[in-house]
């Protein structure tokens, strides 16, 4: 009367989870390294660069030892979508002088949005509760100059270097807890 | 020139702290993580904690959790490492080493600070 | 913690000769083509200096007669030809997990 129920679902070593996640934040954050290296031999970054629209660093000093899986995990999900869209818009508006910059924009392009599936599966295979669907975001405004396309490149690759460090860190942490 | 230039060696009773500065020059200091590295006496290295210089995020060895605290004062591009409770086991060479952000391979050396715990 | 063990302890190789240092981790510390294994050279008083990271990565300024391979659990640091200064101890050293640990050291003599 049908064909025999499929064996049981076995759960996933969340450690082996967690490494694959990890090579991959790793390997991402080797590529925005070298990207941002990149922009700084062609366009000198002159002090600190911000934008306002990148997420807050999601660290402080002590953080780090407090970390739990879930909010890591959420958190760095909101942050990496927020700068897959930035670099997005940066590949869109960031004008003549950032085309230098591709193919390798567009590689991490493909790159952020390939760790960010894998966080979302990593969150499903972990049974943790799914964020809700994030609100649309209001469209960001174009650079007001080539130079301001610059200095929002140099930004948008220097959070997200910061912000995988933070990552490779805290996921690093939390698999000695497991 | 890329360099990590040391406070020099240290003589201090057991019981006492000291704090060995690593001063940083010839690249941009928030670029890198910095660790730290203790030689013992038979040559063997243990790796015992990294600090961020950008947010000041540090990452212990359980072995030296409550031993070492790492610090850094990004104005003057130096790292600091306190120890404390010091014993004749501490008595040994320490480094500060660059961190690669995310893959813990360390490029530059410091000279090395040498601590000798002794009454 | 992974435990990185060296062999040989010491090792004399004649000049010219090719000289191999194997390590071994207590559990593997490779996936998806990428190992976090690293190689160090020191001599006396002076602070390790790194030659390879990441495998088989040549850092720059050392020289191509350095060579690394290996994945999973075995590493191996080769040099060919071996020349006088490169009498010293080497170490290998992962970063797969928290903590990074180092292995024992292998010393090497030249003859």
């Known amino acids: 009367p049908g064909p025999p129920p499929g064996p049981p679902r076995v759960s996933p070593d969340p450690r082996a989870e967690l490494d694959s996640t990890v090579l991959l934040t790793r390997s991402l954050l080797a590529d925005t390294r070298q990207l941002a290296a990149q922009l700084r031999d062609k366009f000198p970054a002159d002090g600190d660069h911000n934008l306002d629209s990148l997420p807050t660093l999601a660290m402080s000093a002590g953080a780090l030892g407090a970390l739990q899986l879930p909010g890591v995990l959420t958190r760095l999900r909101a942050d990496l979508l927020s700068y897959l869209r930035h670099v997005q818009w940066l590949r869109r508006a960031g004008g003549s002088s950032l085309k230098t910059l591709e193919p390798e924009l567009g590689t991490l392009q493909a790159r952020l949005d390939r760790l960010l599936r894998r966080l979302q599966l990593l969150m499903s295979r972990l049974a943790l509760p799914q964020p809700p669907p994030d609100p649309p975001a209001p469209p960001l405004a174009p650079p007001s100059s080539a130079w301001g396309g610059i200095r929002a490149a140099h930004a948008i690759l220097g959070g997200l270097h910061l912000t995988l460090d933070w990552a490779v860190r805290g996921l690093l942490l939390l698999k000695t807890r497991l | 020139e890329v360099q990590l230039q040391q406070s020099g060696p240290e003589l201090v009773k057991p019981g006492a702290s000291v704090k060995i500065s690593c001063k940083a020059s010839?690249?941009?200091?928030?670029?890198?993580?910095m660790d730290w590295v203790k030689q013992s006496q038979g040559k063997r290295l243990e790796w015992i904690g990294d600090i961020n210089p950008n947010y000041g995020g540090t990452i212990y060895n359980q072995k030296f959790k409550g031993k070492a605290t790492l610090t850094v004062d990004k104005s003057s591009s130096t790292a600091y490492m306190e120890l404390r409770s010091l014993t004749s086991e501490d008595t040994t060479v320490y480094y500060c080493?660059?961190?690669?952000?995310?893959?813990?391979?360390?490029?530059?050396w410091g000279t090395g600070t040498t601590v000798t715990v002794s009454s | 913690d992974i435990v990185l063990t060296q062999s040989p302890p010491s090792l004399t190789v004649s000049l010219g000769q090719r000289a191999t240092i194997s390590c071994r981790a207590s559990?593997?510390?490779?996936?998806?083509?990428?190992?976090?294994m690293h190689w160090y050279q020191q001599k006396p008083g002076q602070p390790p200096k790194l030659l390879i990271y990441l495998t088989s990565n040549l850092e720059s300024g050392v020289p191509a007669r350095f060579s690394g391979s290996g994945s999973g659990t075995d590493f191996t640091l080769n040099i060919h030809p071996v020349e006088e200064e490169d009498a010293a101890t080497y170490y290998c050293q992962h970063s797969w997990d928290l903590p990074p640990t180092f292995g024992g050291g292998t010393k090497l003599e030249i003859k």
């Open positions: 080493t660059r961190g690669e952000l995310g893959h813990w391979y360390f490029d530059v």
């Open positions: 559990k593997s510390v490779s996936a998806s083509g990428y190992s976090y």
């Open positions: 010839g690249y941009t200091f928030t670029d890198y993580n």
